[in-house]
Amino acid sequence: MNGRVDYLVTEEEINLTRGPSGLGFNIVGGTDQQYVSNDSGIYVSRIKENGAAALDGRLQEGDKILSVNGQDLKNLLHQDAVDLFRNAGYAVSLRVQHRLQVQNGPIGHRGEGDPSGIPIFMVLVPVFALTMVAAWAFMRYRQQL
């Protein structure tokens, strides 16, 4: 993965109550199933419609889950992480890292590679160009007066 991706990273504590069909999301990652280059963390790959996580509304696809009920998810095999979630009980506390991508490049945490967010340069370049055109037109107008 070359290039640079800038993120606005925020952390949040999310408390979920296990629903009839569990926690209502899918996970990827682990030391044996890296989802992100050089990161064996656990990520949310899918939110189940009308599941516990979807009804709560805060957990998003692409979020990194740092801990479950205070237990760190670092350096776990994928299946060990799955078992941790499945045995976490009725009330589950998740420490979650949200990442908002603010500049394009190779996608860091979205495995399927769909760019989320608009690259800054795509906004700045047209704005700068418009400013220059407006300044030039203004100067021409002043010279004619």
Epitope: S21, G22, L23, V28, Q33, R46
Partner: nanobody, 125 residues
Framework: QVQLVESGGGLVQAGDSLRLSCAAS????????MAWFRQAPGKERDFVAT????????NYADSVKGRFTISRDNAKNTVTLQMNSLQPEDTAVYYC???????????????????WGQGTQVTVS
């Protein structure tokens, strides 16, 4: 573009065997939970079998346990369903399905899967 393409269906006699294959493209296959479902005429789509990302964990519908075997090859992006001792009640269109990651909800509901193949017809006479 995600594509799941099934093959291997056909017309067989009761007691015969058949091997269905599903070739996946457009996804990072090794991250996906894969499954087979089937739909008989006039009936709902039913769960047949599922397999986790590494192939180490499988789950089967009671009606096919001991007769059907699901497997996967992550190097070739394929999932297969070996069907033995086929019975007339196994007649259906068989669908391959996939979803990213491991579910913490369940894997037997068609709504748990995002991607589907077009299906392959299996007829047991």
């Amino acid at each position: 573009q995600v594509q799941l393409v099934e093959s291997g269906g056909g017309l067989v006699q009761a007691g015969d065997s058949l091997r269905l294959s599903c070739a996946a493209s457009g996804i990072t296959f090794r991250w996906y939970t894969m499954a087979w479902f089937r739909q008989a005429p006039g009936k709902e789509r039913d769960f047949v079998a599922t397999i986790n990302w590494s192939g180490s964990d499988t789950n089967y519908a009671d009606s096919v346990k001991g007769r059907f075997t699901i497997s996967r090859d992550n190097a070739k992006n394929t999932v297969t369903l070996q069907m033995n001792s086929l019975q007339p009640e196994d007649t259906a269109v068989y669908y391959c399905a996939g979803v990213p990651g491991t579910s913490l909800s369940g894997e037997t509901d068609p709504r748990d899967y995002d991607y589907w193949g077009q299906g392959t017809q299996v007829t047991v006479s």
